[in-house]
Interface confidence: medium
């Protein structure tokens, strides 16, 4: 007997308030079909229905939040319906505060080695997921620690690929409503460097500048980059800048710092669009200093 | 500017179809839903249904079941219903109208097309 | 589905005059899927108020939207020509998202 394929769209973890798409293929292409839920909460918009080709669910409540199967219809089947599809798990966000996730030792990974990505938070979560964006499989289901001050989870990830890198955000939940979720975590960028030959840093007017002085920092390469990326040693984030093909065949970015006040150990990275979490190698660090100010770090 | 531009007025025989569209310019069409209303003369406003045109998922009003079908054509940005087995309780002013949400749960319509006067008669 | 009732049904102002109108739920509705559009004759709705207390662009100020739970109300602090119309209430609280009968409002 056919059984139809569930799907979701745009995924299965769905903020509160918001509309998911619930899909129903049939491979012998009938386009009508009904759905259930298995658990949870009862979704009374779907009792005594059938639905043609998908079906616009929303906005959703806590109470949409568990497991759908469709049954399409079946002309040959006694009862006129198909078996039941896969399960689809429908997990609510928003229903909890947030959890924060980090990565150690630090978001920028070489390729070959391992991350840990922490999730924590002050609420007790049982449970939390990981959620790669852009991903429509089900995220990483984890098993939280609890502790006086709330809960963690550790999850170790590698040897790191560019399969791997991606924007990540976790959740918590508790083990009675497995489905609804904490809101997301703020994202953050996993980045897999050493996929290309390292790019060099220059600074103008030169690495030593005195207090209030603009420096620009340039990061060229002979490799066809289309953005260059500055980080600054101990500090979170990067600047981000479009490569320009220069006429002696580098493409370089020129990054100006404005009027610096204390000093610091820069690094430049290359990526190309296609792969924006894929880095090169790092420059060689440059250090620029700041005379005239005891913040020369 | 952002516009929903309705098909003009249709005049049909009972039993028949009609198909009214609503053409969307000034945002990107894929990002919001459409939703459609009907009004009959003199009296108020009632939810047939909503689209989502990234998707082509679609969610309907019960009493509207079996009478619109809501499809969506992303590369002309024009939503479309067609109204099957009309009767005289069809006739109607039919209006699309944009889907949008304030914050993440604050959904209201915001955008409305100018209207499309479906009359059945014999 | 959620059932919005407004009242009066219609209703006439003097110039200058303030006005309000009500919108009862049958269930409870978050005040932020609470909205109401203003429609005027051979024209669609226009989108007024969101959220219970949101002007939408272009709205003036003498409107103005509260209330919570169940019941809902849409004030204007001093009635013009041009506020004569119909208002809806609406929700989206719940699918599938329902209006209120509507209030007309005239001029005395």
């Known amino acids: 007997q056919d059984k139809p394929f569930l799907s979701a769209w745009p995924g299965t973890v769905v903020s509160e308030g918001q509309h998911v798409t619930l899909q129903c293929r049939s491979r012998l292409g009938f386009n009508e079909f009904s759905l259930s839920k298995e658990d949870g909460m009862p979704v009374p918009e779907l009792y005594n229905r059938i639905f043609r080709n998908s079906f616009l669910m929303g906005p959703v409540t806590p109470a949409h939040a568990g497991t759908y199967r469709c049954c399409s219809s079946h002309p040959h089947s006694p009862t006129g319906w198909s078996a039941p599809s896969n399960p689809v798990v429908i997990m609510v966000t928003g229903v909890h505060r947030k959890p924060s996730l980090l990565a150690h030792p630090g978001p920028l990974v070489k390729s070959g080695e391992t991350v840990i990505l922490q999730c924590w938070s002050d609420v007790r979560f049982e449970r939390f997921l990981l959620h790669r964006e852009g991903i429509t499989e089900d995220p990483l289901r984890l098993v939280g620690q609890l502790h006086d001050a709330g809960s963690q989870v550790n999850y170790s990830m590698g040897p790191m690929t560019p399969a791997l890198a991606g924007t990540y955000r976790c959740f918590g939940s508790v083990t009675h409503l497995p489905y609804e979720l904490s809101a997301p975590s703020d994202p953050l960028d996993i980045v897999v460097v050493g996929l290309y030959g390292k790019p060099s840093l220059s600074a103008q007017p030169g690495p030593t500048v005195q207090a209030g002085e603009n420096v620009t920092l340039s990061c060229s390469s002979r490799s066809l980059f289309d953005i260059y990326h500055l980080s600054r040693e101990a500090e979170a984030g990067e600047l981000r800048l479009t490569a320009v093909l220069r006429v002696n065949g580098t493409f370089q970015a020129n990054f100006p710092l404005g009027p610096v006040t204390h000093g610091g150990n820069y690094r430049c990275f290359g990526s190309f669009r296609a792969l924006p979490h894929a880095w090169s190698d790092p420059s060689d660090p440059l250090p620029v200093s700041v005379t005239g100010n005891s913040r020369n770090l | 500017k952002v516009q929903l531009q309705q098909s003009g007025a249709e005049l049909v025989r009972p039993g028949t179809s009609v198909k009214v569209s609503c053409k969307a310019s000034?945002?990107?069409?894929?990002?919001?839903?459409i939703e459609w209303v009907k009004q009959r003369p003199g009296q108020g406003l009632e939810w047939i249904g909503v689209?989502?045109?990234?998707?082509?998922?679609?969610n309907d009003n019960e009493k509207f079941r079996d009478k619109a079908t809501l499809t969506a054509d992303k590369s002309s940005s024009t939503a479309y219903m067609q109204l099957s087995s009309l009767t005289s309780d069809d006739s109607a002013v039919y209006f699309c109208?944009?889907?949008?949400?304030?914050?993440?749960?604050?959904?209201?319509?915001?955008?409305w097309g100018a209207g499309t006067t479906v009359t059945v008669s014999s | 589905q959620i059932v919005l009732t407004q009242s009066p049904a219609i209703m006439s102002a003097s110039l200058g005059e303030r006005v309000t109108m009500t919108c009862t739920a049958s269930?409870?509705?978050?005040?932020?899927?609470l909205h109401w559009y203003q429609q005027k004759p051979g024209s669609p709705p226009k989108f007024w108020i969101y959220s219970t207390t949101n002007l939408a662009s272009g709205v003036p100020t003498r409107f103005s939207g509260s209330g919570s739970g169940t019941s809902y109300s849409l004030t204007i602090s001093n009635m013009e020509a041009e506020d004569a119309a119909t208002y809806y209430c609406?929700?989206?609280?719940?699918?599938?998202?329902?209006f209120g009968g509507g209030t007309k409002l005239e001029i005395k």
């Open positions: 609406h929700q989206y609280h719940r699918s599938p998202p329902t």
């Open positions: 269930a409870s509705v978050s005040s932020s899927s």
């Open positions: 109208a944009r889907g949008n949400y304030y914050g993440t749960t604050d959904w209201y319509f915001d955008v």
């Open positions: 000034g945002y990107a069409f894929t990002n919001y839903l």
């Open positions: 689209i989502n045109p990234g998707s082509g998922g679609t």
